[in-house]
Interface confidence: low
């Protein structure tokens, strides 16, 4: 009984002594953020010198504050407990973690290339002051037609597919209401549109057949080829637009 009581007291004393020696051995653990444990001054907690900070307690040195220089400007001043934060001066925007770089802005309809800001090539657009020119949406991939042509600054606007458009019908189809049982007006108008399209095609082929007899086979081939020829764009090319070739790096900032 007395022996076990002695063991408990001894253990308690050991634990208490260990805690005391630990804090004696490492007084630095008591130094709060904004200070450092100064070895030159008997390990007392000294405040961080100007232009430095410590964001956590128990640090043996303070870190130098980031300096927002050049095209960087100070977004948040450095304090004794937190680093400075930078952003970019007007005309530049941040890149990288913590705004580690500033990149030049361009106008909408342009992208930054190795030779500075260049206009987007025909068939591409950029609606921001940063980033690269992106290709216009290919409406036909979704079975739609181009409603509004694209520009250097704006993407194309896709409308309903040509089959959805009957002569004299509205060019923008409103969203379809919930379907009801029976023949809804939508279904009737759809069949009417389909019939009128079939009639148009029939007329078209009859006219073609007549033109073959009249003008010969060469003309027919020309009519078929023509709609699929790519439009040749000249004015922007001469302006020096930023046409990108497959081997060129995309999006990278040229220093």
């Amino acid at each position: 009984m007395g022996n076990s009581c002695y063991n408990i007291v001894a253990t308690l004393l050991l634990v208490l002594n260990f805690e005391r020696t630990r804090s004696l051995q490492d007084p630095c653990s008591n130094c709060p953020a904004g200070t450092f444990c100064d070895n030159n001054r008997n390990q007392i907690c000294s405040p961080c010198p100007p232009n430095s900070f410590s964001s956590a307690g128990g640090q043996r040195t303070c870190d130098i504050c980031r300096q927002c220089k050049g095209v960087f400007r100070t977004r948040k001043e450095c304090s004794s407990t937190s680093n400075a934060e930078c952003d970019c001066t007007p005309g530049f925007h941040c890149l990288g973690a913590g705004c580690s770089m500033c990149e030049q802005d361009c106008k909408q309809g342009q992208e930054l290339t190795k030779k500075g800001c260049k206009d987007c090539c025909f068939g591409t657009f950029n609606d921001q002051k940063r980033g690269i020119c992106r290709p216009w949406t290919n409406c036909s991939l979704d079975g739609k037609s181009v409603l509004v042509n694209g520009t250097k600054e704006r993407d194309v606007v896709c409308g309903p597919s040509p089959a959805d458009l009957s002569p004299g019908a509205s060019s923008v189809t409103p969203p379809a209401p919930a379907r009801e049982p029976g023949h809804s007006p939508q279904i009737i108008s759809f069949f009417l549109a389909l019939t009128s399209t079939a009639l148009l095609f029939l007329l078209f082929f009859l006219t073609l057949r007549f033109s073959v007899v009249k003008r010969g086979r060469k003309k027919l081939l020309y009519i078929f080829k023509q709609p699929f020829m790519r439009p040749v764009q000249t004015t922007q090319e001469e302006d020096g637009c930023s046409c990108r070739f497959p081997e060129e790096e995309e999006g990278g900032c040229e220093l």
Epitope: K69, G70, L255
Partner: antibody, heavy 122, light 106 residues
Framework: EVQLVESGGGLVQPGGSLRLSCAAS?????????WGWIRQAPGKGLEWVSG????????YYADSVKGRFTISRDNSKNTLYLQLNSLRAEDTAVYYC??????????????WGQGTLVTVSS | DIQLTQSPSSLSASVGDRVTITCRAS??????LGWYQQKPGKAPKLLIY???SLQSGVPSRFSGSGSGTDFTLTISSLQPEDFATYYC????????FGQGTKVEIK
């Protein structure tokens, strides 16, 4: 093509002064670039000395030259300068002027001059 | 000031070798680190900026990696024209360079 040509180096006695010039061609130094002077003592590594912000409103100096060297620029002459005063033997080095890239203010130098040698000796 | 320590200070290698040079910062510098190559009597040439971005016109055998305090420059297959001295440089707080690593022919 951007070209930077330094001049003004030479032999000078301790305590003496020199003015280094860096003439830029093929590029306007007022176009928002950051510019810097970097030196290299014979057989030693590179040491950044001084810098001037793209808009000329902020200047930077290494502790070793603070109060003795002054960086400036003359946009009309398209030239960057470094005024060296109270020269010491340890300032002996090849001095390069260099340009910070246009699309970044991160302090990397993409164009360098060929350097001008400054020798401080009695 | 922020100190940069390069290792090794010099190394011998053969053409075709893979070479790795490290640069350690005395405190975290995010990705604000560049690498330069310098040949005797010439001005330094920028190879890598922002820790890992390859400067225009620099061969793709050069690559950079790292963030915070530890950075690496790798030459995947050493070419005869790559024998030179390489410097790292931080731009987090003003600018400082490492002491350099000389790459010599074995």
């Amino acid at each position: 093509e951007v070209q930077l040509v330094e001049s003004g180096g030479g032999l000078v006695q301790p305590g003496g002064s020199l003015r280094l010039s860096c003439a830029a061609s093929g590029y306007s130094i007022s176009s928002g670039h950051h510019w810097g002077w970097i030196r290299q003592a014979p057989g030693k590594g590179l040491e950044w000395v001084s810098g001037i912000s793209g808009y000329g409103d902020t200047t930077y100096y290494a502790d070793s030259v603070k109060g003795r060297f002054t960086i400036s620029r003359d946009n009309s002459k398209n030239t960057l300068y470094l005024q060296l005063n109270s020269l010491r033997a340890e300032d002996t080095a090849v001095y390069y002027c260099a340009r910070d890239p246009y699309s970044s203010g991160s302090g990397y130098f993409d164009y360098w001059g060929q350097g001008t040698l400054v020798t401080v000796s009695s | 000031d922020i100190q940069l320590t390069q290792s090794p200070s010099s190394l011998s290698a053969s053409v075709g070798d893979r070479v790795t040079i490290t640069c350690r910062a005395s405190q975290g510098i995010s990705s604000a680190l560049g690498w330069y190559q310098q040949k005797p009597g010439k001005a330094p040439k920028l190879l890598i900026y922002a820790a890992s971005s390859l400067q225009s016109g620099v061969p793709s055998r050069f690559s950079g990696s790292g963030s915070g305090t530890d950075f690496t420059l790798t030459i995947s297959s050493l070419q005869p024209e790559d024998f030179a001295t390489y410097y790292c440089q931080q731009s987090y707080y003003t600018w400082t360079f490492g002491q350099g690593t000389k790459v010599e022919i074995k």
